[in-house]
Interface confidence: low
């Protein structure tokens, strides 16, 4: 092969001598340098030589970054010239032109990772968050990766973003609570690492819920409180009905009986139970969120102002970890969540025309089960198109959570969502064109 300098003035002077030597070598040695005769139409070095059928000889190819400026003959090898700017040839070739450099097409979702050189075409890949949807030796068109729903993550392929996301469930002990093309499953929080205990196990879509360790509880207390939780609303209803009846029908005897009934304390309860030693009843099977705190699971949204009051300071001194509300989904409440509050003396006292209640009043302010939802109720999440592994049956949707009151101090239940932060954005699939 001859490079451009061979055709310059000094090169031409040496030309006849060089060609004469080539002729002698070709005649005397069958293993000579190109051009050389080939009867079987194959050349020794197929990468760097090619068969020229017109003359039945093997000639040199031009190296990468060059092209054929003059074809070979029986007495002269191929003459090569360097590719002009913005053109290239990648391989040993016998092309008479260089190929034009093409930019990466952003409309097609491609971005440049290496510029074009005389020896290599522009290197492109799919933009972050995209995958190669059209492939013809190289990627020509990228499309947006599809989201993986909560409880799943994109199975991470290697470097070539040649395929769309394949969403796989989070492995055991991990969760992912967003719809995203790149969010990765995160390990469940280990409550014990933070000096807390598990209140509700994590699922594939939500983190473990943590709470402060509770002191041992007298077994009979929870029974008493369960009675109270169920009977108090009933007692109120009866009280109101009776009062209404007293006013309406003027039955003084009935009013007197009611007064004497309300002066009694609930059976088996002493005057001063120890503050803080009481456990509220476990979730009722039909009203599972009656005693559960309304704490949202963390979502992949910014903690912008939601118009909610700030969480009150807990008496035990544990900072309340506030999670941003995910306004797109119903809060997922797990059965069995418990809370701990301080209490004074429990009892119902009616004196004269007024009624004093010391103790915990549970006010159920949710919609009537089975009834139409109110205008302020969040819609229940539609059933997702994939299975959700849950530790327990979720309660009926749409139930609000009551707060507990004791005198003038308001105490939020100390159940916490530990470490529940919006999941980190993981890698986005990327594609590199190899040539």
């Amino acid at each position: 092969m001859l490079l451009p300098w061979a055709t310059s003035a000094p090169g031409l002077a040496w030309g006849p001598l060089v060609l004469g030597l080539f002729g002698l070598l070709a005649a005397s040695q069958p293993q000579a340098v190109p051009p050389y005769a080939s009867e079987n139409q194959t050349c020794r070095d197929q990468e760097k030589e090619y068969y020229e059928p017109q003359h039945r000889i093997c000639c040199s190819r031009c190296p990468p970054g060059t092209y054929v400026s003059a074809k070979c003959s029986r007495i002269r090898d191929t003459v090569c010239a360097t590719c002009a700017e913005n053109s290239y040839n990648e391989h040993w070739n016998y092309l008479t032109i260089c190929q034009l450099c093409r930019p990466c097409d952003p409309v097609m979702g491609l971005e440049e990772i290496a510029p074009c050189t005389s020896k290599r075409k522009t290197q492109c890949r799919c933009q972050p968050g995209m995958f190669c949807a059209a492939w013809a030796l190289e990627c020509t068109h990228c499309e947006l990766l599809s989201d993986c729903p909560p409880g799943t993550e994109a199975e991470l392929k290697d470097e070539v973003g040649k395929g769309n996301n394949h969403c796989v469930p989070c492995k055991a002990g991990h969760f992912q609570n967003t719809s995203s093309p790149s969010a990765r499953c995160q390990p469940h929080t280990r409550c014990e690492n933070q000096g807390l205990v598990e209140a509700a196990p994590g699922t594939a879509q939500s983190d473990t819920t943590c709470k402060n360790p509770l002191e041992p509880l007298p077994p009979e207390m929870s029974g008493t409180m369960l009675m109270l939780a169920v009977l108090l609303p009933l007692a109120f209803f009866l009280l109101l009905a009776t009062v209404f009846s007293c006013i309406w029908k003027s039955h003084p005897s009935l009013c007197r009986k009611l007064g004497s009934l309300l002066k009694r304390r609930p059976q088996g309860e002493g005057p001063n139970p120890v503050a803080g030693s009481w456990e509220p009843p476990k979730a009722h099977p039909y009203f599972p969120d009656l005693v559960q705190p309304l704490l949202p699971i963390s979502g992949d949204v910014s903690p912008v102002s939601t118009g909610l009051p700030a969480a009150p300071v807990l008496e035990a001194g544990v900072p309340q970890q506030q999670s941003p509300l995910d306004l797109t989904r119903e809060p997922q409440l797990e059965p069995g969540e418990q809370s701990q509050v301080a209490h004074g003396t429990n009892g119902i006292h009616v004196t004269g025309g007024s009624m004093t209640i010391t103790g915990n009043i549970y006010i159920y302010n949710g919609p009537v089960l089975g009834g139409p939802p109110g205008p302020g109720d969040l819609p229940a999440t539609p059933e997702p198109p994939y299975p959700i592994p849950e530790e327990g049956d979720p309660g009926p949707p749409g139930l609000s959570t009551p707060h507990q009151e004791d005198g003038k101090a308001w105490h939020l239940a100390e159940t916490e969502h530990c470490g529940a932060t919006p999941s980190n954005r993981g890698p986005r699939n990327q594609f590199i064109t190899h040539d």
Epitope: I113, D158, R425, G426, P427, R428, Q430
Partner: antibody, heavy 113, light 107 residues
Amino acid sequence: EVQLLESGGGLVQPGGSLRLSCAASGFTVSSYVMKWFRQAPGKGLEWVSSISGSGGRPFYADSVKGRFTISRDNSKNALYLQMNSLRAEDTAVYYCANDMDVWGQGTTVTVSS
Amino acid sequence: DIQMTQSPSSLSASVGDRVTITCRASQDISSFLKWYQQKPGKAPTLLIYAASALQSGVPSRFSGSGSGTDFTLTISSLQPEDFATYYCQQYNTYPLTFGGGTKVDIK
């Protein structure tokens, strides 16, 4: 020219630690999936770990999970492999590579008492 | 994990021979397969990616074919510099896995 150069190999006792470095030139490590491979003496190639271009979740072979940590320093344009609790079977030549399939020349790690 | 089975584990051939190496995946990997060449004391070099695409600068005597689970690397006319060990590698999913290698030596 795109190049990778590993360093940090050597002789270490079982249970010991080593930190391998991979210095990149001609490209930025933050733009590519970066990988570590290894090859035990007389054996085949084995993938060890990868880290994505956006610096997201790393991936590890089961044989090194919990012991090895892949990381990178974009300011130094370098990739690292922190190897703890080393075992005899970790003895190998360790190569770093990028997703354009540029490989380093390798660095030898020998775990022996 | 996806297992990659390469055969033969070694072969002897002469310059100019046509050489074929096969690689089988334990499950469908589409076309996410690479072929590497490694010479003693050197790092591997990529020959083929995406099962059949020739890496830039690699001689055209190397070619790859196959899709799904069965793949082939062919050297159309073996050259002296081709005596080396060849590995296939799947990159369909993590963990990335290699075949056991095929050593090509001089007959």
